[in-house]
């Protein structure tokens, strides 16, 4: 019992004096509280509370149940304890069988004994089975036995409390552990595709997958920017214990050009949040863009290839594409595919392969692309470079030489006399007229050009040369000159 | 033993809300699964939601999103659901049951509680 | 939601006899099946627990098993305080319940 100094309120005294009691079922009990400012008795077993305004406690036959502490609290608010075993053969453990433990932390199997002269008190596997082996537990006969650090792998497990009474071993009802996870990591969220691009009118929806322990994972759609609660729908799946899967659906049945923006799916839970973002974009209508990979004012040599590649953004889908050249389809010798496999992929590339272009087939190329909504084209103007030809090499009738050539880019004609027989010729000869023939013809092919000098100028035997060039390469013809007095008698032409 | 004791019978109009209770008289509260189970007169078991007090997060039945809130608090041990909205077709009794949450069976059951919607 | 089927909805039997009841899944819970009894304006109460296990103080006579998508509950020898209605109810996805079993006195 209490002892405190004189002046001081003291705790009430109890009899019997005793911190424990043992007494027989069936039997009285009896406990006074002396205490002249005498409150109330209070009885505590499990979760159960009852008072006795009285200060004589007195229960005429004893009930295991009525096991427990009982206290006297006086108007000071000080308070004195006795525990109370009812010992009876047939009941030795009281037991709540609601059994629950946070993980990593210590729980209570809630079984105290109603005779604390039994031995070996302790937790026992139902049917036999072993505990697991790591499992440590700690008894205590006036509440029962604590599970240290509850581990996940204890979930759903079946245990009893046992003691050895008189040489027998009893066990108590059975419990079922239920453990609650600890959140040690944030939850694991995942979105069905990063971006999306829909027209107007078109329904939007999007899939965010939520893996946690539990499902008292917290999880959302929200718009960025924007308070407005979403409409989603769940789904959600124990793919068995502590493995967790809630997918979250946020649909816009209509998409409107202002449904545009960034849409987050937040989850959290107690060890912290995790997001996730998909973009929405909506366009009015479909388009097309084109990109050219190459200039399109293209410079070939003859005999070599080119490859005229595009690249283009077409949304929703290309439905037809299609290279052109002088009004006529190409049917093969071009290749068109996405520039990804990803679902979202809107990007294209189109190549047309030209080989051992001619010089007859420079011109206009143009691509043609559409899809649901518009359609696009780009042409590329090919140009093909081509080393000049001398087309003619003539003595006109008014005596003069002419010399016709053509290639592209547009050939120079330079005019050179050789005197004798020497084959390099050196002096140049200023032509009296250059023309350029088709100017005003088609823009793509050979360039003609005709220069003529006047034959007249040349008073000795030798060798007229006209020389036609450009960047590609050079071609000449000459004019070999043969004097019989003051006549010319000869002009042989020849390359 | 445990027990879930409810609140009493309500009589709501159309339109307006409801706000039930479900004390636990022992026991660790904050660890248990406290769900809502909904029976119209004549017909079947309905879940309409539940929480684990210490988790703080409630879940709910689809057809309830909106305008079910399940809440919970620990210092009392108590556990409440409110349902907005009402229309005629909520009359029903509606119980608290421990358990209904990763994948906890129901093993106990409050007495009901009657919510009648009638203009 | 996953759907469950009970059947048959309702039986009439007679005491002592051996009453099968059963539940399909629309799809796979694995063991996460259980099983309640409910008479008229009482709560439910839990019978068997992850489609097998029998609760704490419910007569030996119930059994539960069945695994995946079908269960069974039995009650080998029905006596006359067994006469009730019996729920299944899936704990996999969001919770649900078949629609009942009514067991009458023949």
């Known amino acids: 019992q209490p002892s405190v100094s004189p002046g001081e309120p003291s705790p009430p005294s109890i009899h019997p004096a005793k911190s424990e009691l043992i007494v027989r079922v069936g039997n009285e009990i009896r406990l006074l509280c002396i205490d002249p400012g005498f409150v109330k008795w209070t009885f505590e077993i499990l979760d159960e509370t009852n008072e006795n305004k009285q200060n004589e406690w007195i229960t005429e036959k004893a009930e295991a149940t009525n096991t427990g502490k009982y206290t006297c609290t006086n108007k000071h608010g000080l308070s004195s304890s006795i525990y109370v075993f009812v010992r009876d053969p047939a009941k030795l453990f009281l037991v709540d069988r609601s059994l629950y433990g946070k993980e990593d932390n210590d729980t209570l199997v809630r079984c105290p004994l109603t005779d604390p002269e039994v031995t070996s008190y302790s937790l026992k596997g139902c049917q036999g089975k072993p505990l697991p082996k790591d499992l440590r537990f700690v008894p205590d006969p006036k509440a029962g036995i604590t599970i240290k650090s509850v581990k996940r792998a204890y979930h759903r497990l079946c245990l009893h409390c046992s003691a050895d009474q008189e040489g027998k071993s009893v066990l108590s009802d059975k419990f079922i552990l239920k453990v609650r996870p600890a959140f040690k990591a944030v939850p694991v969220v995942s979105v069905s595709k990063a971006s999306y691009l829909l027209r107007e009118g078109e329904e939007f929806t999007v899939t965010c997958t939520i893996k946690d322990v539990s499902s008292s994972v917290y999880s959302t759609w929200k718009r960025e920017n924007s308070q407005t609660k979403l409409q989603e729908k769940y789904n959600s799946w124990h793919h068995g214990d502590f493995n967790y899967e809630r997918q979250a659906t946020l649909t816009i049945s209509s998409a409107r050009v202002n449904d545009s923006g960034v849409f987050m799916c937040y989850a959290n839970n107690t060890f912290g949040s995790a997001n996730v973002t998909t973009t929405l974009e909506v366009v009015d209508k479909g388009f097309i863009n084109i990109f050219p990979m190459i200039n399109t004012t293209v410079f070939v040599n003859d005999g070599e290839n080119v490859d005229l590649i595009v690249e283009y953004e077409a949304f929703p889908k290309p439905e037809h594409q299609q290279w052109i050249y002088m009004n006529r389809t190409f049917t093969d010798k071009w290749e068109d595919y996405p520039k990804s496999e990803n679902e979202s992929n809107i990007r294209y590339v189109s190549e047309l392969h030209l080989t051992r272009l001619k010089g007859t087939e420079g011109g206009t190329y143009t691509f043609l692309v559409s899809n649901s909504d518009v359609n696009a084209s780009i042409a590329f103007n090919v140009y093909v470079n081509t080393k000049p030809e001398i087309l003619t090499y003539d003595r006109l009738v008014n005596g003069m030489l002419q010399c016709v050539a053509a290639g592209f880019p547009e050939p120079t004609i330079d005019w050179y006399f050789c005197p004798g027989t020497e084959q390099r010729c050196s002096a140049s000869v200023l032509p009296v007229d250059v023309q350029t023939l088709n100017a005003s013809g088609p823009p793509f092919g050979k360039l003609v050009v005709q220069s003529s000098i006047d034959s007249s100028a040349f008073k000795h035997n030798g060798t007229v040369e006209c020389k036609a060039y450009n960047d590609v390469g050079k071609t000449s013809a000459y004019f070999n000159f043969a004097f019989k007095g003051n006549n010319k008698e000869q002009i042989h032409p020849h390359t | 033993q445990v027990q879930l004791v409810q609140s009493g019978a309500e009589v709501k109009k159309p339109g307006s809300s409801v706000k039930v209770s479900c004390k636990a008289s022992g026991g660790t509260f904050s660890l248990y699964a406290i769900s809502w189970v909904r029976q119209a007169p004549g017909q079947g078991l309905e879940w309409m939601g539940g929480i684990i007090p210490a988790f703080g997060t409630a879940n709910y039945a689809q057809k309830f999103q909106g305008r079910v809130t399940i809440t919970a608090d620990e210092s009392t041990s108590t556990a409440y659901m409110e349902l907005s909205s009402l229309r005629s077709e909520d009359t029903a009794v509606y119980y608290c049951?421990?358990?209904?949450?990763?994948?906890?069976?129901?093993?106990?059951w409050g007495r009901g509680t009657l919510v009648t919607v009638s203009s | 939601d996953i759907q469950m089927t009970q059947s048959p909805s309702s039986l009439s039997a007679s005491v002592g006899d051996r009453v099968t009841i059963t539940c399909r899944a629309s799809?796979?819970?694995?063991?996460?099946l259980n099983w309640y009894q409910q008479k008229p304006g009482k709560a439910p109460k839990l019978l068997i627990y992850?489609?097998?296990s029998l609760q704490s103080g419910v007569p030996s006579r119930f059994s539960g098993s069945g695994s995946g998508t079908d269960f069974t509950l039995t009650i080998s020898s029905l006596q006359p305080e067994d006469f009730a209605t019996y729920y299944c109810q899936q704990g996999v996805s969001d919770i649900t319940f078949g629609g009942g079993t009514k067991v009458e006195i023949k």
């Open positions: 049951a421990r358990g209904g949450l990763d994948t906890d069976e129901f093993d106990l």
């Open positions: 799809q796979s819970i694995n063991s996460y």
């Open positions: 992850a489609a097998s």
